[in-house]
């Protein structure tokens, strides 16, 4: 099999990403400088290992997390980190020309750095539905679409919600899913005769996932702490989201094993179901009063992420073409709302608590925020979907999906690759 | 006990600079986050800047973003905000505050504690 | 921007009044409210936090009710150093901290 890109490709990548990539270093260069107030240094240090384990994450843990697949692990760590480089950029100029762009120039800090990483990692969840599917100049498109969307989000909701910075950005989970689903939903779907073998996880790689998943589990309290305002919060967060992600991967072993008519535990699900806790208290881990509940929300999104990955991998096949090993996708949106449902709660004693006759307006305020979250993702989502299906891009023919070979130059081009 | 001492005010030409600098002590500073509020001669008091406790976000006011930065130094407890482009209608005096965060239900709450005596700034041709 | 406005603008009173002030909201805001003093030529002291949370140090005269939008601070009984001016202050937006714009409390 031929290991060179379509010459279509070849023209068209490298001069839709080199354009794209000069124009953002010219919109650098006219509308932004570094914040010159630094005089702490060693605040400094201190604020950029939070901004460090955010890019660990992102590289490192989605990088490999979606690396399973036996002949696409290469394309999806690789890609993974260009979408990633990508985001980053044009995210911290979006929240830039979004937050401050009427006072002139936008000031870059390492805050608005940290934003950036986690607008690009919603990217990098999203694509975990499409990854095999599409190549690079496709990827492209979907990283400016989601970022750009996600971006108005935040900026939205933190106009009519009032929400901070932790509320507004801990959407991502809910938002990356749908934005995924939907993509993938306006994709080709079929895998043509004899490709089946290629959306199969092989055993080196998953080793790589699970390294991925490590990463990811180690890193998750910085994540859901990395925009909180007070050390009281940060501390909140960080232990919650630790308590939570600990009872999860207990939970997602044995209930793998209990799933299972041999009492065999799935490599697939417990890459993800690792996770489940930090994503299921990510809104609300700075609120959560103490352990024993963070703990109970990790049992109960480990065990929830467990059964979709069962039940959900058919369905999510048949109708949106994704394969059974990319269970981010549905596993982050059902654990998304779990989140949202959580906070919800917390929100309702909060107004009881003070007295307030106004539950249901504040309820209300908060499902409305879910839902604009989740029309946003969907229909930004579908846009993208139908912009990657446009020739020009020259989408990856069915039978070359999933396929390392179509993007990377091997020298000893191993059959079985 | 807590003390914060703001310096730095004084009378400026209009558009021309001006660094103000908040002391404090009594407490662990970096462990706060800060805040700058002013209030005009005769009126009532309006919030301008906050920076985190490390220091790693700030957000101001919209009538200063772009003109006004929030800085601070934890290894010596200082505070300090950089005014440029500086405006008639920015004749205030100048109070720091320290930011206390308390747990609620959906979100936290926050509320400044303590304040220093303030520091008149004029701007005037 | 969340707006808060205080009424009334300015009252007198006498030593030993039952003082009411209120602060509404532009919208709901909770608990989510503070309560200042602040003398003439002097800084601003918190009251109370959290709506009705009395501040530590702060006489038990003082009292603050109320949630959603409409907030009410309490003078039981008027003392002499009271008089002055009376700042409410949300920090449901967190990303702009604002003020009403003040009740000054005179001597009748």
């Known amino acids: 099999m031929s290991s060179k890109y379509p010459r279509s490709v070849r023209r068209c990548l490298p001069l839709w990403a080199l354009t794209l990539e000069a124009a953002l270093i010219l919109l650098f260069y006219f509308f932004t400088h570094y914040d010159a107030s630094l005089e702490d240094q060693k605040g400094l240090v201190a604020s950029y290992q939070v901004g460090q384990d955010l890019t660990v994450m992102a590289a490192i843990g989605l990088g490999f997390l979606t690396s399973s697949f036996r002949r696409h692990s290469w394309s999806s760590v690789a890609f993974n980190l260009f979408m990633l480089a990508l985001g980053v950029q044009w995210a911290i100029l979006l929240d830039g020309f979004l937050s401050q762009f009427p006072s002139g120039k936008v000031v870059i800090t390492l805050f608005s750095i940290r934003l950036a990483t986690m607008s690009a990692l919603s990217v990098l969840i999203s694509v975990d539905a499409v990854l095999g599917k599409v190549n690079l100049a496709q990827l492209v498109v979907m990283v400016l679409v989601e970022v750009t969307a996600l971006g108005n989000l935040r900026m939205v909701i933190s106009n009519i919600f009032n929400t901070d910075y932790h509320m507004n950005m801990m959407h991502i989970y809910v938002f990356a899913a749908y934005f995924g689903l939907s993509v993938a939903w306006c994709l080709p779907k079929p895998l043509p005769e004899g490709t089946e073998d290629k959306d199969q996880t092989a055993t080196i790689p998953s080793l790589s996932a699970m390294l991925g998943a490590l990463f990811l589990w180690m890193f998750w309290p910085s994540f859901n702490s990395a925009l909180l305002r007070s050390p009281i919060e940060r501390k909140n967060a960080v232990f919650n989201t630790y308590y939570a992600v600990a009872v999860s991967v207990v939970t997602a072993i044995s209930g793998s094993s209990l799933a299972h008519p041999q009492g065999k535990i799935s490599k697939t699900y417990v890459h993800s179901a690792v996770l489940a806790g930090g994503v299921a208290v990510g809104t609300s881990c700075h609120l959560i009063p103490s352990p024993w509940l963070a703990m109970v929300l990790g049992l109960v999104a480990g065990l929830i992420s467990v059964g979709g990955a069962k039940y959900l991998p058919g369905c999510c096949n048949r109708v949106l073409g994704i394969p059974h090993s990319s269970i981010m996708g549905y596993n982050f949106s059902l654990l998304g709302l779990l989140g949202e449902i959580i906070y919800i709660v917390l929100l309702v004693l909060d107004t009881v608590g003070a007295g307030n006759g106004m539950i249901g307006f504040q309820v209300l305020l908060s499902i409305g925020e879910l839902s604009l979250a989740i029309v946003i993702a969907l229909m930004s989502g579908l846009l993208t979907g139908l912009l990657l299906n446009l020739k020009i891009w020259k989408a990856p023919h069915e039978a070359k999906y999933f396929d390392d070979q179509v993007f990377w130059k091997f020298p000893h081009l191993a059959v079985g690759f | 006990q807590v003390q914060l001492v703001e310096s730095g005010g004084g009378v400026v030409q209009p558009g021309r600079s001006l660094r103000l600098s908040c002391a404090a002590s009594g407490f662990t500073f970096r462990t706060y986050g800060m805040h700058w509020v002013r209030q005009a001669p005769g009126k009532g008091l309006e919030w301008v800047a906050v920076i985190w406790y490390d220091g790693s976000n700030k957000d101001y006011a919209d009538s200063v973003k772009g003109r006004f930065t929030i800085s601070r130094d934890n290894s010596k407890n200082t505070l300090h905000l950089q005014m440029n482009s500086l405006r008639a209608e920015d004749t205030a005096v100048y109070y720091c505050a320290r930011e206390i965060a308390s747990r609620g239900y959906s979100r936290y709450l926050y509320y400044l504690d303590f304040w220093g005596q303030g520091t008149l700034v004029t701007v005037s041709s | 921007d969340i707006q808060l406005t205080q009424s009334p603008s300015s009252l007198s009173a006498s030593v030993g009044d039952r003082v009411t002030i209120t602060c509404r909201a532009s919208?709901?805001?909770?608990?989510?409210l503070n309560w200042y003093q602040q003398n003439p030529g002097k800084a601003p002291k918190l009251l109370i936090y959290g709506a009705s949370n009395l501040q530590s140090g702060v006489p038990s005269r003082f009292s603050g009710s109320g949630s959603g939008t409409d907030f009410t601070l309490t003078i039981s009984s008027l003392q002499p150093e009271d008089f002055a001016t009376y700042y409410c202050?949300?920090?449901?937006?967190?990303?702009?901290?604002?003020f009403g714009g003040g009740t000054k409390v005179e001597i009748k």
């Open positions: 202050q949300q920090s449901y937006s967190t990303l702009a901290l604002t």
């Open positions: 919208q709901s805001i909770s608990s989510y």
